[in-house]
Each structure stands twice: as structure tokens, then as C-alpha cells.
Interface confidence: medium
């Protein structure tokens, strides 16, 4: 729980399609993509690997063949089940030396329509370098989308795009502890469009969740819940058609 987090000082827009390895290291970052126009990327996310990061590990690849914008998502049934047996998911906040969540994933729901609201189990909680990917299409005339990373009855991270809050589009992030919502963090950059496909990627970092939408970095949310291994479920709800929800280690 160090104080010296890097928040989203670092937003792409510098012309580097893969600043500091986020998110192009695993996405299909289109040319020229990059979050907030005009924002600089001044060597941000200290301690993170430089561009072209994660040496020696193959990038997770590009979901070839999925419907619409996400060519090539695996066919139904392709995702293997998560590892089983004692010790597969250590309770510490960091992966073990042998690789708690092996990088072989992804694990989760097979591609194809999923019933919303949908719960994606995260059996060992979340750990740094874990990447959660959600593919779907926003329904026409959508009102809201919600991702809820849940720790028992608490919501460690609530990611809530709102399509019409007082005639404005806004993304609200928050945490619910003891049945009380905390202080909201609001983001006016809004990459979702009614009727259009989307890809949400949530990367777990030691100090924060990092969110990218359609391969562009969107926001960062500092952890307000310390024991990441207790965040054991992701709830996905709202006005979407959900194609797939999965996680892997990068």
C-alpha cells in the first residue's frame, strides 16, 4: 500500500502505440489509437517494463475470428478450466515463483452469447499482472454498463459507464464497503457507443486497476481493498450483449 502510486498522469497520445506496454502488448492497438488526445506519457507507471515489454513471454494475441470488431475469438469450449488442486491460487497478493495463475490461460467463459447479468468466478482472487478481458456489444439505446469486482458483499471496484446521467455520458468508479458506497471517481472520456461492439480490458497492478477500452487506455483506479486474493467474483451487468469474459496472466 505504498503512497507513491502513479495515477493516470500517463495517458497515451504521444504517438507511441504501446506506451509502457499498455495496452498494446496484448491488444490490437489500432494505429493512432491512444486515449486522451494531447496528453503526454512522461515515462509513467514507474517500475513498469518499457515499450515492447514482458520479454520472453508471447503476447496473448488478438482474439482472431470473433464477431465484428474482434476477429478470431476462440470457438466455444476452447477455454480450459482453471487449474485445480491445492496451491493453484496462492493467497498472497503476488503470484508465486512457479506461477500462480499460469500464463497459459485464458480461463473463463467460452466465446458465444452469455446471459447478462453474468458472474465470472475468480477462484484465487486477483493478482498483479492478471488481465481480465470482456467482449460484447452495447445494446441500442443503452443506459448503463457495470463491472463489479466483488469481495463477499463488498464491491472492491465498481466500473459504471452511464450513457445518460443528466444528459451526459460519464463513467463512475467507486467501492462499496459495509454496504456503503464510497467517494466517486468520475471520468468524462467515454469510449462506448450504443449498438457498437467493445472490448474492455482490466489489468490488475499492485496498486491499482488499469482499464482500457477498445485498446486505448482509459483510467486507473487505486485499490481501496487491500486483500486482492479475496476479490473472487466479477459481476457483469447492464445493457450489453456479452460475447465472452475471461482472464489470463501476462
Amino acid at each position: 500500500m505504498a503512497d507513491n502510486f502513479s495515477l493516470h498522469d500517463a495517458l497515451s497520445g504521444s504517438g507511441n502505440p504501446n506506451p509502457q506496454g499498455w495496452p498494446g502488448a496484448w491488444g490490437n492497438q489500432p494505429a493512432g489509437a491512444g486515449g486522451y488526445p494531447g496528453a503526454s506519457y512522461p515515462g509513467a507507471y514507474p517500475g513498469q517494463a518499457p515499450p515492447g515489454a514482458y520479454p520472453g513471454q508471447a503476447p496473448p494475441g488478438a482474439y482472431p475470428g470473433a464477431p465484428g470488431a474482434y476477429p478470431g475469438a476462440p470457438a466455444p469450449g476452447v477455454y480450459p478450466g482453471p487449474p485445480s488442486g491445492p496451491g493453484a491460487y496462492p493467497s498472497s497478493g503476488q503470484p508465486s515463483a512457479t506461477g500462480a495463475y499460469p500464463a497459459t490461460g485464458p480461463y473463463g467463459a467460452p466465446a458465444g452469447p452469455l446471459i447478462v447479468p453474468y458472474n465470472l468466478p475468480l477462484p484465487g482472487g486477483v493478482v498483479p499482472r492478471m488481465l481480465i478481458t470482456i467482449l460484447g456489444t452495447v445494446k441500442p439505446n443503452a443506459n448503463r454498463i457495470a463491472l463489479d469486482f466483488q469481495r463477499g458483499n463488498d464491491v472492491a471496484f465498481h466500473f459504471n459507464p452511464r450513457f445518460n446521467e443528466n444528459n451526459r455520458r460519464v463513467i463512475v468508479c467507486n467501492t462499496k464497503l459495509d454496504n456503503n458506497w464510497g467517494r466517486e471517481e468520475r471520468q468524462s472520456v467515454f469510449p462506448f457507443e450504443s449498438g457498437k461492439p467493445f472490448k474492455i480490458q482490466v489489468l490488475v497492478e499492485p496498486d491499482h486497476f488499469k482499464v482500457a477500452v477498445n485498446d486505448a487506455h482509459l483510467l486507473q483506479y487505486n485499490h481501496r481493498v487491500k486483500k486482492l486474493n479475496e476479490i473472487s467474483k466479477l459481476g457483469i451487468s447492464g445493457d450489453i450483449d456479452l460475447t465472452s469474459a475471461s482472464y489470463t496472466m501476462i
Epitope: 500500500m1 505504498a2 503512497d3 507513491n4 502510486f5 502513479s6 495515477l7 493516470h8 498522469d9 463488498d154 467501492t175 464497503l177 459495509d178 464510497g182 467517494r183 471517481e185 496498486d207 491499482h208 486507473q220 487505486n222 485499490h223 481501496r224 481493498v225 487491500k226 486483500k227
Partner: antibody, heavy 122, light 111 residues
Framework: EVQLQQSGAEVVKPGAPVKLSCKAS????????LNWVKQRPGRGLEWIGR????????HYNQKFKDKATLTVDMSSSTAYIQLSSLTSEDSAVYYC???????????????WGQGTSVTVSS | DIVLTQSPASLAVSLGQRATISCRAS??????????MNWFQQRPGQPPKLLIY???NLESGVPARFSGSGSGTDFSLNIHPMEEDDAAMYFC?????????FGGGTKLEIK
């Protein structure tokens, strides 16, 4: 209702230690940092340090590193501060304050105890 | 350590008028567009009460006559219109990094 109930006033001899308590109620104790703040008359407020009850992680103001020790008792939702080798400079009101997790560890101190007066006198 | 310099040390304002208290930090309190400056009110014999967090966010239950502004190194607390109940000490405090520090305080009185 969130409440932080602090122990009563103390009069302590120079060189002696003292241990103050702060009992939390109305929220889940291990979800929030617990801060300690010193206030001397006419000398403003000084942040001593904080403790995370979930795992007893502590962050201290270096100025108080050798003076204060922060601990918690999870079973009773109580935080403690032990002050060692007291001198007249330690005469003050000591407050505990809950640290909200807004923006991670940088959240504001949103609920405060009523304070404990410590007087160092021979 | 980050030093917070608060001014004025004391201030007398007529009821219904505006009170402005300033706080200058020895280095920027900004991180990613968020300014980690908080404001507290303290009445005699009571603990400090959070009024404003992250420079401009009004704490729940605090009257809207209180407002905060600023970024980087310069911040201010405004009270308008001044009410009798507002006579108190006011402190700025940063939470950008450990150790957290407070300003020296401003004593606000009714003129």
C-alpha cells in the same frame, strides 16, 4: 454510525511511557487505515503515523519513529498508540482518525475520535 | 517533507460576507490531475472536522457555503455567506505522500 472512542486523559511522569486506545465501531475495522495526530496548544496539528488493521502495516512520520508505536487488536476493533520516554514536549492532545480509502492510501481523515489529553508532569 | 503555509493567521469577516483562506505547498500536490489537499474546521475543545477533500470535493453533510479550489501548490478555502457557526480554526492538510502535514491554521472570527 461511525464512532472512534478514545481513552481518558493521562497524567504521566517524565521518562515514563503511556498507551492510549481508540475503539472503533460502526464500520468494518480492517477496511480503513487508522491515523494518529498530535495537537499541542498553539502549535497546530502533526501527523504521527497510521496503521492498517488488516495486517498491521504501519507508516510513520520520521519525527515520531522513536517516540510512537502503533498497534491494533482486531478482536476488539481497537487501535493503540504507545508513547515512550515522555517529556514535556509530549504534552498534547492525541487524536485517532479513520483514513478513507479514496484514491487508495491518499484518502482523507473523515472520522475523528474526541482526543486524549496527555500531560507530562513530575 | 512538504511544508504547507497557511494565510492569514487570523481573519475577521462580517456575517454574510466571504471568507477566503489560502494554503501554499512547498511542492505540487497534484498527481494525475488530482490535488491531494484537504481542509478541516476545528472548534474549541473538539476534534477537526473534514470539510473539503481532494482540493474541491465537499464532504458529505458539509454546507454548500464551503468550497475549495486550487491545484499544484496554491489552494484556497472559501466560505460564503459567512455564518456565526463558522467562527473556528481552519487547517489545510495534504495527503500526497507520507508524512502528511498540516498548515499552521487560520483563526476565523466574526467582525
Amino acid at each position: 454510525e461511525v464512532q472512534l472512542q478514545q481513552s481518558g486523559a493521562e497524567v504521566v511522569k517524565p521518562g515514563a511511557p503511556v498507551k492510549l486506545s481508540c475503539k472503533a465501531s460502526g464500520y468494518t475495522f480492517n477496511n480503513y487505515w487508522l491515523n494518529w495526530v498530535k495537537q499541542r496548544p498553539g502549535r497546530g496539528l502533526e501527523w504521527i503515523g497510521r496503521i492498517d488493521p488488516s495486517d498491521s502495516e504501519t507508516h510513520y512520520n520520521q519525527k515520531f519513529k522513536d517516540k510512537a508505536t502503533l498497534t491494533v487488536d482486531m478482536s476488539s476493533s481497537t487501535a493503540y498508540i504507545q508513547l515512550s520516554s515522555l517529556t514535556s514536549e509530549d504534552s498534547a492532545v492525541y487524536y485517532c482518525a479513520r483514513g478513507d480509502y479514496y484514491y487508495g492510501t491518499r484518502g482523507p481523515m473523515d472520522y475523528w475520535g474526541q482526543g486524549t489529553s496527555v500531560t507530562v508532569s513530575s | 517533507d512538504i511544508v504547507l503555509t497557511q494565510s492569514p493567521a487570523s481573519l475577521a469577516v462580517s456575517l454574510g460576507q466571504r471568507a477566503t483562506i489560502s494554503c501554499r505547498a512547498s511542492e505540487s500536490l497534484d498527481n494525475s490531475g488530482i490535488s491531494f489537499m484537504n481542509w478541516f474546521q476545528q472548534r474549541p475543545g473538539q476534534p477537526p472536522k473534514l470539510l473539503i477533500y481532494a482540493a474541491s470535493n465537499l464532504e458529505s453533510g458539509v454546507p454548500a457555503r464551503f468550497s475549495g479550489s486550487g491545484s499544484g501548490t496554491d489552494f484556497s478555502l472559501n466560505i460564503h455567506p459567512m455564518e456565526e457557526d463558522d467562527a473556528a480554526m481552519y487547517f489545510c492538510q495534504h495527503s500526497k505522500e507520507v508524512p502528511w502535514t498540516f498548515g499552521g491554521g487560520t483563526k476565523l472570527e466574526i467582525k
